[in-house]
Protein backbone atom coordinates (compact mmCIF):
# COMPACT_ATOMS: atom_id res chain seq x y z
CA UNK A 1 0.00 0.00 0.00
CA UNK A 2 2.32 2.73 -1.25
CA UNK A 3 1.74 6.16 0.25
CA UNK A 4 2.42 9.40 -1.64
CA UNK A 5 5.63 11.20 -0.66
CA UNK A 6 3.52 13.93 0.90
CA UNK A 7 3.71 12.12 4.25
CA UNK A 8 7.47 12.64 4.48
CA UNK A 9 7.20 16.32 3.60
CA UNK A 10 4.42 16.62 6.15
CA UNK A 11 6.78 15.27 8.84
CA UNK A 12 9.31 17.98 7.99
CA UNK A 13 6.64 20.67 8.04
CA UNK A 14 5.35 19.44 11.41
CA UNK A 15 8.85 19.63 12.86
CA UNK A 16 9.21 23.22 11.68
CA UNK A 17 5.80 24.03 13.17
CA UNK A 18 6.96 22.54 16.49
CA UNK A 19 10.03 24.76 16.46
CA UNK A 20 8.09 27.95 15.78
CA UNK A 21 5.37 27.15 18.32
CA UNK A 22 7.67 26.03 21.12
CA UNK A 23 10.05 28.95 20.75
CA UNK A 24 10.46 30.78 24.06
CA UNK A 25 13.97 32.20 24.26
CA UNK A 26 15.60 33.38 21.01
CA UNK A 27 16.02 30.32 18.78
CA UNK A 28 19.64 29.11 18.76
CA UNK A 29 20.60 32.13 20.88
CA UNK A 30 19.75 34.43 17.98
CA UNK A 31 22.28 32.84 15.63
CA UNK A 32 22.38 34.25 12.12
CA UNK A 33 22.38 32.15 8.93
CA UNK A 34 22.62 32.92 5.25
CA UNK A 35 19.31 33.69 3.62
CA UNK A 36 18.57 31.46 0.62
CA UNK A 37 16.72 31.66 -2.65
CA UNK A 38 13.58 29.59 -2.05
CA UNK A 39 12.68 29.14 -5.71
CA UNK A 40 14.81 26.08 -6.47
CA UNK A 41 16.84 23.42 -4.71
CA UNK A 42 15.35 24.52 -1.42
CA UNK A 43 16.23 21.43 0.65
CA UNK A 44 19.96 21.39 -0.05
CA UNK A 45 20.20 25.18 0.17
CA UNK A 46 18.37 25.20 3.52
CA UNK A 47 20.64 22.46 4.81
CA UNK A 48 23.77 24.26 3.64
CA UNK A 49 22.68 27.31 5.59
CA UNK A 50 21.44 25.62 8.77
CA UNK A 51 24.35 23.19 9.03
CA UNK A 52 26.57 26.08 10.07
CA UNK A 53 24.58 26.37 13.31
CA UNK A 54 26.06 24.08 15.94
CA UNK A 55 25.09 23.36 19.52
CA UNK A 56 21.43 24.18 18.95
CA UNK A 57 19.38 21.13 19.91
CA UNK A 58 16.13 22.79 18.80
CA UNK A 59 17.03 22.47 15.12
CA UNK A 60 19.05 19.23 15.17
CA UNK A 61 16.07 17.15 14.04
CA UNK A 62 15.35 19.61 11.23
CA UNK A 63 18.98 19.50 10.10
CA UNK A 64 18.82 15.73 10.06
CA UNK A 65 15.48 15.58 8.25
CA UNK A 66 16.71 17.93 5.51
CA UNK A 67 19.50 15.45 4.74
CA UNK A 68 16.87 13.00 3.57
CA UNK A 69 15.72 15.51 0.96
CA UNK A 70 19.17 16.43 -0.36
CA UNK A 71 21.02 13.99 -2.63
CA UNK A 72 24.55 15.05 -1.76
CA UNK A 73 26.62 15.30 1.37
CA UNK A 74 26.55 18.75 2.93
CA UNK A 75 29.33 20.03 5.18
CA UNK A 76 29.68 23.16 7.29
CA UNK A 77 31.15 26.04 5.33
CA UNK A 78 29.75 24.74 2.05
CA UNK A 79 27.88 27.54 0.26
CA UNK A 80 25.39 27.16 -2.54
CA UNK A 81 24.82 29.47 -5.45
CA UNK A 82 21.26 29.64 -4.10
CA UNK A 83 22.45 31.74 -1.18
CA UNK A 84 21.18 35.31 -1.23
CA UNK A 85 24.38 37.32 -1.53
CA UNK A 86 25.61 38.81 1.74
CA UNK A 87 22.24 38.55 3.48
CA UNK A 88 22.00 36.97 6.91
CA UNK A 89 18.86 36.49 8.99
CA UNK A 90 18.10 34.99 12.40
CA UNK A 91 17.50 31.23 12.52
CA UNK A 92 13.97 31.88 13.80
CA UNK A 93 13.10 33.95 10.73
CA UNK A 94 14.83 31.43 8.45
CA UNK A 95 12.69 28.62 9.89
CA UNK A 96 9.51 30.67 9.48
CA UNK A 97 10.33 31.49 5.86
CA UNK A 98 11.18 27.88 5.12
CA UNK A 99 7.95 26.72 6.74
CA UNK A 100 5.84 29.09 4.64
CA UNK A 101 7.57 27.88 1.47
CA UNK A 102 7.27 24.17 2.28
CA UNK A 103 3.58 24.58 3.11
CA UNK A 104 3.15 26.16 -0.32
CA UNK A 105 4.95 23.25 -1.98
CA UNK A 106 2.78 20.82 -0.02
CA UNK A 107 -0.43 22.53 -1.12
CA UNK A 108 0.73 22.53 -4.72
CA UNK A 109 1.73 18.87 -4.55
CA UNK A 110 5.37 19.58 -5.33
CA UNK A 111 7.17 16.93 -3.31
CA UNK A 112 10.46 16.66 -5.16
Amino acid sequence: SPVPPSTALKELIEELVNITQNQKAPLCNGSMVWSINLTAGVYCAALESLINVSGCSAIEKTQRMLNGFCPHKVSAGQFSSLRVRDTKIEVAQFVKDLLVHLKKLFREGQFN
Epitope: P2, P5, A8, N67, G68, F69
Partner: antibody, heavy 123, light 106 residues
Framework: EVQLLESGGGLVQPGGSLRLSCAAS????????MSWVRQAPGKGLEWVSA????????YYADSVKGRFTISRDNSKNTLYLQMNSLRAEDTAVYYC????????????????WGQGTTVTVSS | SYELTQPPSVSVSPGQTASITCSGD??????ACWFQQKPGQSPVLVIY???KRPSGIPERFSGSNSGDTATLTISGTQAMDEADYYC?????????FGTGTKVTVL
Protein backbone atom coordinates in the same frame (compact mmCIF):
# COMPACT_ATOMS: atom_id res chain seq x y z
CA GLU B 1 8.23 5.59 22.03
CA VAL B 2 9.35 4.09 18.73
CA GLN B 3 9.19 0.31 18.78
CA LEU B 4 9.90 -2.44 16.25
CA LEU B 5 8.92 -6.03 16.91
CA GLU B 6 10.10 -8.79 14.57
CA SER B 7 8.46 -12.20 14.23
CA GLY B 8 8.41 -15.16 11.88
CA GLY B 9 11.85 -16.62 12.49
CA GLY B 10 12.44 -20.31 12.98
CA LEU B 11 14.07 -23.46 11.68
CA VAL B 12 13.75 -24.18 7.97
CA GLN B 13 15.37 -26.65 5.60
CA PRO B 14 17.69 -25.54 2.80
CA GLY B 15 15.64 -24.52 -0.22
CA GLY B 16 12.69 -23.64 1.99
CA SER B 17 10.85 -20.36 2.54
CA LEU B 18 10.04 -18.11 5.46
CA ARG B 19 8.32 -14.76 5.87
CA LEU B 20 9.48 -12.32 8.52
CA SER B 21 7.27 -9.55 9.85
CA CYS B 22 8.08 -6.35 11.69
CA ALA B 23 5.33 -4.50 13.56
CA ALA B 24 6.13 -0.81 14.00
CA SER B 25 4.67 1.68 16.46
CA UNK B 26 5.37 5.14 17.86
CA UNK B 27 6.07 6.93 14.58
CA UNK B 28 4.50 7.68 11.20
CA UNK B 29 5.49 4.38 9.62
CA UNK B 30 4.54 5.35 6.06
CA UNK B 31 6.92 8.33 6.05
CA UNK B 32 10.09 6.39 6.79
CA UNK B 33 12.24 3.99 4.86
CA MET B 34 12.70 0.63 6.59
CA SER B 35 15.53 -1.88 6.35
CA TRP B 36 16.38 -5.45 7.24
CA VAL B 37 19.87 -6.12 8.61
CA ARG B 38 21.16 -9.55 9.60
CA GLN B 39 23.95 -10.97 11.71
CA ALA B 40 25.22 -14.51 11.34
CA PRO B 41 26.37 -16.25 14.55
CA GLY B 42 29.67 -14.73 15.68
CA LYS B 43 29.85 -12.52 12.59
CA GLY B 44 29.37 -8.85 11.74
CA LEU B 45 26.37 -6.88 10.55
CA GLU B 46 25.14 -7.31 6.98
CA TRP B 47 22.49 -5.13 5.39
CA VAL B 48 19.89 -7.18 3.53
CA SER B 49 17.23 -4.92 2.03
CA ALA B 50 15.49 -1.54 2.25
CA UNK B 51 12.11 -0.14 1.26
CA UNK B 52 11.80 3.60 0.72
CA UNK B 53 9.08 5.58 2.46
CA UNK B 54 9.13 8.17 -0.31
CA UNK B 55 8.07 5.95 -3.20
CA UNK B 56 7.97 2.22 -3.90
CA UNK B 57 11.71 1.84 -4.42
CA UNK B 58 13.30 -1.31 -3.01
CA TYR B 59 16.97 -2.13 -2.57
CA TYR B 60 18.75 -5.47 -2.03
CA ALA B 61 22.17 -6.79 -1.14
CA ASP B 62 23.69 -8.89 -3.95
CA SER B 63 23.72 -11.91 -1.65
CA VAL B 64 19.90 -12.04 -1.48
CA LYS B 65 18.85 -10.50 -4.81
CA GLY B 66 16.33 -12.69 -6.61
CA ARG B 67 15.63 -14.78 -3.50
CA PHE B 68 14.34 -12.26 -0.95
CA THR B 69 11.50 -9.75 -1.37
CA ILE B 70 10.88 -6.79 0.92
CA SER B 71 7.39 -5.33 1.19
CA ARG B 72 5.36 -3.14 3.50
CA ASP B 73 1.75 -2.61 4.46
CA ASN B 74 1.39 0.98 5.62
CA SER B 75 -2.19 0.40 6.74
CA LYS B 76 -0.90 -2.20 9.20
CA ASN B 77 2.38 -0.45 10.06
CA THR B 78 4.17 -3.65 9.12
CA LEU B 79 7.32 -4.47 7.17
CA TYR B 80 7.87 -7.92 5.64
CA LEU B 81 10.74 -9.97 4.28
CA GLN B 82 9.81 -12.95 2.13
CA MET B 83 12.78 -15.32 2.00
CA ASN B 84 12.85 -18.05 -0.63
CA SER B 85 15.47 -20.61 -1.69
CA LEU B 86 17.07 -20.35 1.73
CA ARG B 87 20.65 -21.44 2.21
CA ALA B 88 22.73 -22.37 5.25
CA GLU B 89 24.54 -19.03 4.95
CA ASP B 90 21.23 -17.22 5.51
CA THR B 91 21.27 -18.41 9.11
CA ALA B 92 21.30 -15.26 11.22
CA VAL B 93 19.47 -12.94 13.55
CA TYR B 94 17.38 -10.62 11.36
CA TYR B 95 16.83 -7.08 12.60
CA CYS B 96 14.13 -4.69 11.46
CA UNK B 97 15.44 -1.12 11.38
CA UNK B 98 13.82 2.29 11.14
CA UNK B 99 15.63 4.10 8.38
CA UNK B 100 15.49 7.67 7.14
CA UNK B 101 13.00 10.17 5.83
CA UNK B 102 12.67 11.45 2.27
CA UNK B 103 13.96 10.30 -1.12
CA UNK B 104 17.54 10.17 0.14
CA UNK B 105 16.73 8.25 3.31
CA UNK B 106 20.24 6.80 3.41
CA UNK B 107 21.56 10.26 4.36
CA UNK B 108 19.73 10.02 7.68
CA UNK B 109 21.07 7.26 9.94
CA UNK B 110 19.53 4.02 11.20
CA UNK B 111 18.02 5.18 14.46
CA UNK B 112 15.92 2.39 15.87
CA TRP B 113 16.51 -1.36 15.78
CA GLY B 114 14.21 -4.19 16.80
CA GLN B 115 15.34 -7.02 19.05
CA GLY B 116 15.73 -9.39 16.11
CA THR B 117 14.29 -12.73 15.11
CA THR B 118 16.44 -15.83 14.57
CA VAL B 119 16.41 -17.73 11.30
CA THR B 120 18.15 -21.11 11.19
CA VAL B 121 18.58 -22.90 7.85
CA SER B 122 19.58 -26.49 8.44
CA SER B 123 18.63 -30.00 7.40
CA SER C 1 31.63 -3.91 -4.47
CA TYR C 2 32.36 -1.25 -1.87
CA GLU C 3 34.22 -2.31 1.27
CA LEU C 4 34.78 -0.71 4.66
CA THR C 5 37.75 -2.03 6.62
CA GLN C 6 38.18 -1.76 10.39
CA PRO C 7 40.84 -3.13 12.74
CA PRO C 8 39.60 -6.38 14.34
CA SER C 9 40.37 -5.21 17.86
CA VAL C 10 41.37 -2.20 19.93
CA SER C 11 42.45 -2.33 23.58
CA VAL C 12 42.27 0.66 25.90
CA SER C 13 42.75 1.35 29.59
CA PRO C 14 39.90 2.97 31.56
CA GLY C 15 40.00 6.74 31.25
CA GLN C 16 42.15 6.63 28.15
CA THR C 17 41.17 7.41 24.53
CA ALA C 18 40.22 4.73 22.05
CA SER C 19 40.27 5.45 18.32
CA ILE C 20 38.66 3.16 15.76
CA THR C 21 39.28 3.70 12.07
CA CYS C 22 37.09 2.79 9.11
CA SER C 23 38.70 2.85 5.67
CA GLY C 24 36.99 2.94 2.29
CA ASP C 25 37.58 4.51 -1.10
CA UNK C 26 36.64 8.23 -0.91
CA UNK C 27 34.70 7.57 2.28
CA UNK C 28 34.95 11.27 3.11
CA UNK C 29 32.57 11.99 0.23
CA UNK C 30 29.89 9.95 1.98
CA UNK C 31 28.17 10.16 5.34
CA ALA C 32 29.58 7.71 7.87
CA CYS C 33 27.61 6.26 10.78
CA TRP C 34 28.85 4.26 13.76
CA PHE C 35 27.02 1.58 15.73
CA GLN C 36 27.78 0.05 19.09
CA GLN C 37 26.74 -3.53 19.82
CA LYS C 38 27.07 -5.30 23.14
CA PRO C 39 26.79 -9.10 23.43
CA GLY C 40 23.21 -10.33 23.04
CA GLN C 41 21.90 -6.84 22.27
CA SER C 42 20.75 -4.97 19.18
CA PRO C 43 23.08 -2.37 17.65
CA VAL C 44 22.78 1.24 18.80
CA LEU C 45 23.53 4.28 16.64
CA VAL C 46 26.24 6.33 18.36
CA ILE C 47 27.33 8.66 15.53
CA TYR C 48 25.55 9.78 12.37
CA UNK C 49 26.52 12.31 9.67
CA UNK C 50 30.21 11.67 10.42
CA UNK C 51 30.22 13.46 13.76
CA LYS C 52 26.71 13.99 15.14
CA ARG C 53 25.58 12.26 18.33
CA PRO C 54 21.97 11.11 18.72
CA SER C 55 20.30 12.22 21.95
CA GLY C 56 21.28 10.01 24.86
CA ILE C 57 24.74 9.21 23.53
CA PRO C 58 27.49 10.45 25.90
CA GLU C 59 29.74 13.32 24.83
CA ARG C 60 32.79 11.08 25.10
CA PHE C 61 31.80 9.61 21.70
CA SER C 62 32.91 11.71 18.73
CA GLY C 63 33.50 11.12 15.05
CA SER C 64 35.28 12.54 12.03
CA ASN C 65 35.45 11.65 8.36
CA SER C 66 37.76 12.86 5.60
CA GLY C 67 39.70 11.42 2.70
CA ASP C 68 39.44 7.64 2.85
CA THR C 69 39.03 7.31 6.61
CA ALA C 70 36.30 7.80 9.19
CA THR C 71 37.29 7.69 12.85
CA LEU C 72 35.28 7.01 15.98
CA THR C 73 36.91 8.35 19.13
CA ILE C 74 35.93 7.39 22.67
CA SER C 75 37.47 9.82 25.17
CA GLY C 76 37.74 8.82 28.79
CA THR C 77 36.74 5.27 27.95
CA GLN C 78 34.63 3.47 30.54
CA ALA C 79 34.12 -0.23 31.20
CA MET C 80 30.59 0.05 29.79
CA ASP C 81 32.06 1.05 26.41
CA GLU C 82 33.42 -2.47 25.89
CA ALA C 83 31.55 -3.67 22.79
CA ASP C 84 31.75 -4.28 19.06
CA TYR C 85 31.69 -1.16 16.88
CA TYR C 86 30.66 -1.00 13.21
CA CYS C 87 30.95 1.82 10.72
CA UNK C 88 28.45 2.13 7.90
CA UNK C 89 28.00 4.08 4.66
CA UNK C 90 25.82 4.05 1.55
CA UNK C 91 27.29 3.31 -1.87
CA UNK C 92 25.69 2.47 -5.20
CA UNK C 93 22.20 1.81 -3.82
CA UNK C 94 23.39 -0.40 -0.99
CA UNK C 95 24.33 0.04 2.65
CA UNK C 96 27.78 -1.23 3.55
CA PHE C 97 28.86 -2.12 7.08
CA GLY C 98 32.45 -2.20 8.19
CA THR C 99 34.11 -5.43 9.28
CA GLY C 100 33.68 -4.52 12.96
CA THR C 101 36.07 -3.71 15.79
CA LYS C 102 36.00 -5.28 19.25
CA VAL C 103 36.91 -2.69 21.88
CA THR C 104 38.32 -4.18 25.05
CA VAL C 105 38.65 -2.06 28.17
CA LEU C 106 41.61 -3.47 30.09
Amino acid sequence: EVQLLESGGGLVQPGGSLRLSCAASGFTFSSYAMSWVRQAPGKGLEWVSAFSGWDVSTYYADSVKGRFTISRDNSKNTLYLQMNSLRAEDTAVYYCVQDGLGPYFYNYGMDVWGQGTTVTVSS
Amino acid sequence: SYELTQPPSVSVSPGQTASITCSGDKLGDKYACWFQQKPGQSPVLVIYHDSKRPSGIPERFSGSNSGDTATLTISGTQAMDEADYYCQAWDSSTYVFGTGTKVTVL
